[in-house]
Amino acid sequence: ESALITQQDLAPQQRAAPQQKRSSPSEGLCPPGHHISEDGRDCISCKYGQDYSTHWNDLLFCLRCTRCDSGEVELSPCTTTRNTVCQCEEGTFREEDSPEMCRKCRTGCPRGMVKVGDCTPWSDIECVHKESGTKHSGEVPAVEETVTSSPGTPASPCSLSG
């Protein structure tokens, strides 16, 4: 995505006051936290906790805030300029190829394999073959030992499919 001007980059007289419901577009665009009016003459505030916009835009409507699904925790709430940040609950993770749901982490590695990576909100436990050190992906046919998973700390934003 190309670099976008932040509200702070504007001259003071062009900044939208925090409480302002409407302001004028700058070169046809409205600042983050706003959308453009139907006639293009005004910038209208997004509704806090309901919708948002992150960039300078000429959108007719703000984007709906994501709602964290059950099985997710809300790391930060939706504001007028930033979407909700959701993260999978402890013991579950979100895969890149199925971002719409959190999946349970495996509790241990198959026979002949050792755990080299913990369960995090964005990855399952990582197992490697004892001898070769090659990674294993896929379901667990048999569990040799039960491993307690520990959650990671960094956050990953939710997809907009809430």
Epitope: E38, Q50, D51, D58, L60, F61, R64, L160, G162
Partner: nanobody, 124 residues
Framework: EVQLLESGGGEVQPGGSLRLSCAAS????????MSWFRQAPGKGLEFVSA????????YYAESVKGRFTISRDNAKNTLYLQMSSLRAEDTAVYYC?????????????????WGQGTLVTVKP
Amino acid sequence: EVQLLESGGGEVQPGGSLRLSCAASGRTFTNYAMSWFRQAPGKGLEFVSAINWSGDSTYYAESVKGRFTISRDNAKNTLYLQMSSLRAEDTAVYYCASAESFSRGGLPYGMNYWGQGTLVTVKP
């Protein structure tokens, strides 16, 4: 993924009315802004109307203002376009589309989905 299916098109006389529907499948209907576009024979795609995710904000092209009304029923996952005082120039295939939002020029923002269209013919 959202699938959209338009219905309600048909032939009507000038001055008449029609109500188009767009049924959406998929649990994420309420996350999306919805819109109607149309394409007249031999012409390009025209942005007709749009409505936000909650249904409390709407947009209309000048050509349909005061004659068309867009609405949505989130409980039924359905978008509507009530068309009245129809004119010959309203003859077109009408498409519904969903996106995270739409620009004033009708450009969809983010993930967007389109229906197959329904034909509206206005003639005496």
